[in-house]
């Protein structure tokens, strides 16, 4: 049979099962891609959007690796990547995505590796990805690259439906904490890259989750803004005993100023000012507990005093009752006088 034609602006190799359409100013995916293509590079173009049907079988039944990086893509629409039965690797990096449809891959995709480096800078794209992942459309995903996206927080539950995930790259973002991130479902996770973020401390909840992941062997935490106060004590203890953290010897304090540059592994509890008020939420919590105990003690003492003086109190109560009765009788008499018209003059002229 004659060799399949190569789309005009592209370069093709049947021997390499590859088509490259690189920096060709394309505004759409070429419709006449050869059926042998396993590796498709459409990069550095001006696609703008990826509509449903732009890439579809049966012509692309063999397509396993798709690189769509740097194409000025703003939208990946519902069904755009749904009809690719062999797709295992997708790179959407360097696109200013505003919309990533939760139905972009259809109901289920064989995709194993997804790169979104620098493509989730807009909230719409991040939320779309979160919905897409939570819907379970990418349950076969083993590698997820979310680096260089300026992320402050991950949407809650975003990583909950990724049972096959082995490698997660969150480097070069602005993550300030991991409190709302659940790692528990990532039972196959082997490597986690959190370098170049704004993490100040790792809390016990996160550390406990990591301890519970049997395959997790490589955690990268370099170049974060570690705050070396009392709250970091548990993290330092974990670091000292963990063999999961790459280059842990190089991790150092960023704050407070007097601790800047100090190696985390060389910190002592005495240096961490655990008596000083540092972590406001936990200090408040401690204060409330203490206040509760004090109030309970006062209440108990009060009840004890009442019990010990029960006879005196009973006598005192009787006295009060008698006094009240006398007082009320006076009111009662006065009311009767006021009610009788014959006694009106008397009441107005007397001090009853």
């Amino acid at each position: 049979q004659p060799p399949a034609a190569c789309p005009a602006p592209c370069e093709c190799s049947e021997a390499a099962k590859t088509v490259k359409c690189v920096n060709k100013n394309l505004t759409e995916v070429p419709p006449d891609l050869p059926p042998y293509v396993r590796n498709l590079f459409i990069t550095g173009n001006r696609l703008g959007r990826l509509p449903a049907g732009a890439l579809s079988a049966p012509r692309l039944a063999e397509l396993g690796s798709l690189n769509l990086s740097g194409n000025h893509l703003r939208a990946v629409e519902a069904g755009a990547l749904a009809a690719l039965p062999a797709l295992r690797q997708l790179d959407l990096g360097g696109n200013p995505l505003a919309e990533l449809s939760p139905l972009a891959f259809g109901r289920a995709s064989p995709l194993e590796e997804l790169a979104l480096r620098g493509a989730l800078r807009e909230q719409g794209a991040l939320l779309g990805l979160a919905d897409l992942l939570q819907a379970g459309a990418l349950r076969n995903l083993s590698r997820l690259e979310l680096a260089d996206n300026g992320l402050l927080l991950l949407p809650t539950g975003m990583l909950g439906a990724l049972p096959a995930l082995r490698h997660l790259d969150l480097s070069n973002n602005s993550l300030v904490g991991l409190r709302n991130v659940s790692f528990q479902g990532l039972v196959r996770l082997q490597s986690l890259n959190l370098s170049d973020n704004s993490l100040g401390v790792l809390r016990n909840g996160t550390l406990a989750q990591w301890r519970g992941l049997p395959a997790l062997r490589r955690i990268s935490l370099s170049h974060n803004t570690w705050v070396c106060d009392c709250a970091i004590e548990d993290m330092v203890a974990w670091l000292k005993e963990s063999d999961q953290v790459e280059g842990k010897e190089a991790l150092s304090c960023a704050f407070p100023e007097k601790m800047a540059g100090r190696a985390l592994l060389k910190l002592n509890t005495s240096e961490l000012n655990c008596s000083a008020p540092v972590d406001v939420p936990s200090q408040l919590q401690t204060s409330y507990v203490f206040l509760g105990i004090v109030l309970a003690l006062i209440g108990a003492i009060f009840l004890l005093v009442l019990y010990l003086n029960r006879k005196g109190i009973k006598k005192w109560m009787h006295n009060i009752r008698d006094a009240c009765r006398d007082h009320m009788e006076g009111y009662h008499y006065r009311y009767e006088i006021n009610a009788d018209p014959r006694l009106t003059n008397l009441s107005s002229n007397s001090d009853v």
Epitope: E11, E14, A15, N39, N67
Partner: antibody, heavy 122, light 107 residues
Framework: QVQLQQWGAGLLKPSETLSLTCAVY????????WSWIRQPPGKGLEWIGE???????NYNPSLKSRVTISVDTSKNQFSLKLSSVTAADTAVYYC????????????????WGQGTTVTVSS | EIVLTQSPATLSLSPGERATLSCRAS??????LAWYQQKPGQAPRLLIY???NRATGIPARFSGSGSGTDFTLTISSLEPEDFAVYYC?????????FGQGTRLEIK
């Protein structure tokens, strides 16, 4: 990471059939092309042919009439048969795996067997 | 078939020097070209794929460039372990072909 281990007869007489097998460890068969390359003593590398996981083959035209490459996915093995050998077929024979999809992976013959020296002599 | 011609056949340099190896194709291979290093008694080792991409674990002193018919492998500062034979290989068309090799030896 995929590793390859190869074996087969090292000494042949002219007109016999060279038979080599390569076992694949630590990886899946899909996505890869399984190749055979040879290197005569003191010379350069010569591509013999390749097969993919579906059994589709491509051969060097200079050897095509004598070469058969087959795959046994159940055993994770692929084999080379070269018929009617002569002294010119004396070489180190390598099996190699080329990963046919790009990502963090290589784009060439990225994993090689240890090589089997085959000598054809009467 | 596509013929790859490597030059020079032998290159004599000292450690620390810069090495430039050339590979020319008889017709365009786009960027479907790889470079391999082979030491005596060993299998070849992939250095560069797709003309300019370094394979995993390859030091930064190795770089590849070129497209179409002319390709270059550059070793910025030679280390003692770099002295070996270097081959280019094209995967643009069947049959896949290798260059005849450039021997890099210590001066």
């Amino acid at each position: 990471q995929v590793q390859l281990q190869q074996w087969g007869a090292g000494l042949l007489k002219p007109s016999e059939t060279l038979s080599l097998t390569c076992a694949v460890y630590g990886g899946s068969f899909s996505g890869y092309y399984w190749s055979w390359i040879r290197q005569p003593p003191g010379k350069g590398l010569e591509w013999i042919g390749e097969i993919d996981h579906s059994g589709s083959t491509n051969y060097n035209p200079s050897l095509k009439s004598r070469v058969t490459i087959s795959v046994d996915t159940s055993k994770n093995q692929f084999s080379l048969k070269l018929s009617s050998v002569t002294a010119a077929d004396t070489a180190v024979y390598y099996c190699a795996a080329w990963f046919g999809e790009l990502w963090d992976y290589y784009y060439g013959m990225d994993v090689w067997g240890q090589g089997t020296t085959v000598t054809v002599s009467s | 078939e596509i013929v790859l011609t490597q030059s020079p056949a032998t290159l004599s340099l000292s450690p620390g020097e810069r090495a430039t190896l050339s590979c020319r194709a008889s017709q365009s291979v786009s960027s479907f070209l790889a470079w391999y290093q082979q030491k005596p008694g060993q299998a070849p080792r992939l250095l560069i794929y797709d003309a300019s991409n370094r394979a995993t674990g390859i030091p930064a002193r190795f770089s590849g460039s070129g497209s179409g018919t002319d390709f270059t492998l550059t070793i910025s500062s030679l280390e003692p372990e770099d002295f070996a034979v270097y081959y280019c290989q094209q995967r643009s068309n069947w049959p896949l072909t290798f260059g005849q090799g450039t021997r890099l030896e210590i001066k």
